[in-house]
């Protein structure tokens, strides 16, 4: 009998370095000005290893006094990046991550960019714009998404194990056909979760089982033919 505890199928999605942004063009700014100002906070899921651009409220830069980006990351002191228009000076406080920068010169573009988003970029980002008409702010709860690595293998007769390793948030595992299943979740210190589903199929006409992993970054299915019951030689179907 071969060792069928070997990993039979694996999957890891590869993403080219993509960019995502919630910024709006000039036309949208005029159309949605009041709406955007009302929507102060936005939850924003972003795939790990992509680039992200975060935007300030759509205020014309000519009306500006000060722009401040406040960045609150887990386990770190609050970082602020400020630009004062009158003196054309920028100032940073407690900012150590070199991947979080102004998109360009803040006097030309107030947007913030994160190059190659990592799990550590999970957190709250807020742009505060001080103008003669008052203060306007826009916040982002940035949720970094991590694609789980999916594996499917057999560890004993008519029992299969499907794992979605180190996903963020936790993946959901389902099976075709449904079996007698137990699911466990393991939480890691970096915020990722490993989900492990172990199923057994007593019904002998089940030939192949399919593990379907659902995740915010995309879905993945793997299948495997079940081993025969030990000692079973012949059966008519």
């Amino acid at each position: 009998q071969p060792n069928n505890s070997l990993m039979l199928q694996t999957s890891k999605e590869n993403h080219a370095l993509a960019s995502s942004s919630l910024c709006m063009d000039e036309k949208q700014i005029t159309q949605n000005y009041s709406k955007v100002l009302a929507e102060v906070n936005t939850s924003w899921p972003v795939k790990m290893a992509t680039n992200a651009v975060l935007c300030c409220p759509p205020i014309a830069l000519r009306n500006l006094i000060i722009i401040t980006w406040e960045i609150i990351l887990r386990g770190q002191p609050s970082c602020t990046k400020a630009y004062k228009k009158e003196t054309n000076e920028t100032k940073e406080t407690n900012c150590t991550d070199e991947r979080i920068t102004w998109v360009s010169r803040p006097d030309q573009n107030s947007d913030l960019q994160i190059r190659t988003v990592a799990i550590t970029h999970d957190g709250y980002y807020r742009c505060i714009m001080v103008t003669p008409d008052g203060n306007f702010h826009r916040g982002y709860h940035l949720q970094v998404l991590v694609t789980p690595e999916v594996t499917l293998f057999q560890n004993r007769n008519r029992t299969a194990v499907c794992k979605a390793v180190a996903g963020k948030p936790a993946a959901h595992i389902s099976w075709i056909p449904e079996g007698d299943c137990a699911t466990k979740q393991e939480y890691w210190s970096n915020g990722t979760v490993t989900v492990k589903s172990t199923c057994h199929w007593e019904v002998h006409n089940v030939s192949t089982v399919t593990c379907h992993v659902s995740h915010l970054t995309g879905n993945k299915s793997l299948y495997i033919e079940l081993l025969p019951v030990p000692g079973a030689k012949k059966s008519a179907k």
Epitope: P2, I176, S207, T210, Y223, I224, P228, V229, K234, K237
Partner: antibody
Amino acid sequence: QVQLVQSGAEVKKPGASVKVSCKASGHTFTSYWMHWVRQAPGQGLEWIGNIYPGSGSINYDEKFQGRVTMTVDTSTSTAYMELSSLRSEDTAVYYCLTMTGTSWGRGTLVTVSS
Amino acid sequence: DIQMTQSPSSLSVSVGDRVTITCQASQGTPINLHWFQQKPGKAPKLLISGASNLEDGVPSRFSGSGSGTDFTFTISSLQPEDIATYYCLQFTYIPWTFGQGTKLEIK
């Protein structure tokens, strides 16, 4: 890359038996089920049964029960499908397939004619 | 046994057409399946494995979708070399069962 090489065409008389072979390479022969499928001229595909080379465990479609015998020779990574009491309606191309149906042999034409 | 109802059984097509073939599993039983292309005198060729995974070397105009009991195979823009018979195969339950096939013919 998995390769399945099947034996050559056969012409048989009604009532006789035929044994088709399928030699596998490129994967662990004993770790994957081997399936047999047939296709009569101008017709669709029909599953005959499967065998697990690692243990000799077999499943036959009940339509073929009593007439079909599947065996393996693990020393040569070869699977065999024998069909007995042949009749004209058994005239078909017989295929072996493995890796959950993703790798197929080229087929063996069996003609049953008096 | 799970019966696979494949439709249509034949289709008259032109180059550039969008072609859609469906397979439905009987008894409301969720299954997984493959899609094959077969040309006269040749063994079936796997195009789509596990309902939606395009096999290596298969042109991207071929696609598969669906889950549970209802599945769809699509050719986005038919090419002359796509004239063939197409089959679905459910491999979740023994006996494995094929759809009846869909034969494409040029108009």
